[in-house]
């Protein structure tokens, strides 16, 4: 294999915590998103599995505000507006990366963290377990 | 906002780039997820707005593999298995943070990037525009 020369333009890593601790540029680059993307718009109201968005706020985390979806019904909404309990509203979840201040209150020191968030809801056919 | 007192135990930040560049510990902490989470299970097949998962791979990014949802139909699947085109399958999108090496080839220098991903699909009532 070819050895990569240590690039003189790279940040210095002579740090007792290196290499677990690295430099991260927080000037966030938006790839394939506008500055103000029309995120999933008003789908939470128009969906047959509608959801409410709850604000999860933590000043020690970046991003400090995360919106969590909570399905409004156990069932799914029919065309007449009534809920069909033969179907299920379920949350679609995703693991995301966030930054957490560590040590706490330090303005420029963070740790990567993985959290599971509910992004929205979808209507699914239930799994029926038949009893013999 | 509340000013955070400079903690003497915090890493030094007297840097011309501060606070754009911060120290991040890459030992990922798992909050509220097991090491092997059961990701939204088989909802992509059981949903009335089913979706396929496509692999989006970029070795210069972390995570290198991101699974993107693409709705299978324009409409939504009815109980009889047919597609109802009076309803719409739409993607639920979320902005997520990823890491990208910057400058490229530097082993311990990264930049945060925000990308918009489709996590799954939901069935919505269409917006009907009436022409006068």
């Amino acid at each position: 294999g070819i050895a990569i020369p240590r690039n003189s333009g790279c940040p210095n890593s002579e740090d007792k915590n290196f290499p677990r601790t690295v430099m991260v540029n927080l000037n966030i680059h938006n790839r394939n998103t506008s500055t103000n993307p029309k995120r999933s718009s008003d789908y939470y109201n128009r969906s047959t599995s509608p959801w409410n968005l709850h604000r999860n706020e933590d000043p020690e985390r970046y991003p400090s505000v995360i919106w969590e979806a909570k399905c409004r019904h156990l069932g799914c909404v029919k065309a007449d507006g009534n809920v069909d309990y033969h179907m299920n509203s379920v949350p679609i979840q995703q693991e995301i990366l966030v930054l957490r201040r560590e040590p706490r209150h330090c303005p420029n020191s963070f740790r990567l963290e993985k959290i599971l968030v509910s992004v929205g809801c979808t209507c699914v056919t239930p799994i029926v377990h038949h009893v013999a | 906002g509340i000013a955070i007192p400079r903690n003497s135990g915090c890493p030094n930040s007297e840097d011309k780039n501060f606070p754009r560049t911060v120290m991040v510990n890459l030992n990922i902490h798992n909050r509220n997820t097991s090491t092997n989470p059961k990701r939204s299970s088989d909802y992509y097949n059981r949903s009335t707005s089913p979706w396929n998962l496509h692999r989006n791979e970029d070795p210069e990014r972390y995570p290198s593999v991101i699974w993107e949802a693409k709705c299978r139909h324009l409409g939504c699947v009815k109980a009889d298995g047919n597609v109802d085109y009076h309803m719409n399958s739409v993607p639920i999108q979320q902005e997520i943070l990823v890491l990208r090496r910057e400058p490229r080839h530097c082993p311990n220098s990264f930049r945060l990037e925000k990308i918009l991903v489709s996590v799954g699909c939901t069935c919505v009532t269409p917006i009907v525009h009436h022409v006068a």
Partner: antibody
């Protein structure tokens, strides 16, 4: 707990097809948070990853470049197992073959469960 | 393909001593996708460390991993008799590239 049980012949003739099966208990071959792979080990080559399958609304296959033209990994959902087929074998394919579960979270990649290994000798 | 080079090939140490094993990649890899395995004769490899520094379930605290970019290290702080084995590093870069190092054998001096 999750276990992998390998089966298949220990002797294969040159130019023939090597076939091994890996039966899964305690997990599903269609799991959306795992991939199922084959790795082999020989004194000359060390540990060599051969390929994997994973299910994410459809089956995905990844094969090592070194064997891509000769390898097939197939799932059998009815028996909850997966198989390896390696065509046109030569004596260089003689090795201990392992099946393994790869934890396929997008944030990590590692083999946490291994089969017991099967020594396959290619000889006439 | 990325090549992983492990050194030394053999490490001769006594129980109680500290073992430092190196794994060097031919180009930068994500630490999150680097793992270490232990293998004893006649057995399948066993996962020790994933994500370069996370101990797998049931792995004793004397095992630790570190590194990023191209240089990774597995450290055994105080060798126990059962630690004498061969150790492999492995990385996933992108499909279809998953490679193993050639191994470091830790033997009793």
């Amino acid at each position: 707990q999750v276990q992998l049980q390998q089966s298949g012949p220990g002797l294969v003739k040159p130019s023939q097809t090597l076939s091994l099966t890996c039966a899964i208990s305690g997990d599903s071959v269609s799991s959306s948070s795992a991939a199922w792979g084959w790795i082999r080990q020989s004194p000359g080559r060390g540990l060599e990853w051969l390929g994997r399958i994973s299910y994410r609304s459809k089956w995905y296959n990844d094969y090592a470049v070194s064997v891509k033209s000769r390898i097939t990994i197939n799932p059998d959902t009815s028996k909850n197992q997966f198989s390896l087929q390696l065509n046109s074998v030569t004596p260089e394919d003689t090795a201990v073959y392992y099946c393994a579960r790869e934890v396929d979270s997008i944030y990590y990649s590692y083999f946490d469960i291994w089969g017991q290994g099967t020594l396959v000798t290619v000889s006439s | 393909d990325i090549v992983l080079t492990q050194s030394p090939a053999t490490l001769s140490l006594s129980p109680g001593e500290r073992a430092t094993l190196s794994c060097r990649a031919s180009q930068n890899v994500w630490a999150f996708y680097l793992a270490w395995y232990q293998q004893k004769p006649g057995q399948a490899p066993r996962l020790l460390i994933y994500g370069a520094s996370n101990r797998a379930t049931g792995v004793p605290a004397r095992f630790s991993g570190s590194g990023s970019g191209t240089d990774f290290t597995l450290t055994i702080s105080s060798l126990e008799p059962e630690d004498f084995a061969t150790y492999y590093c492995t990385q996933y870069y992108s499909s279809p590239s998953l490679t193993f190092g050639q191994g470091t054998k830790v033997e009793i001096k």
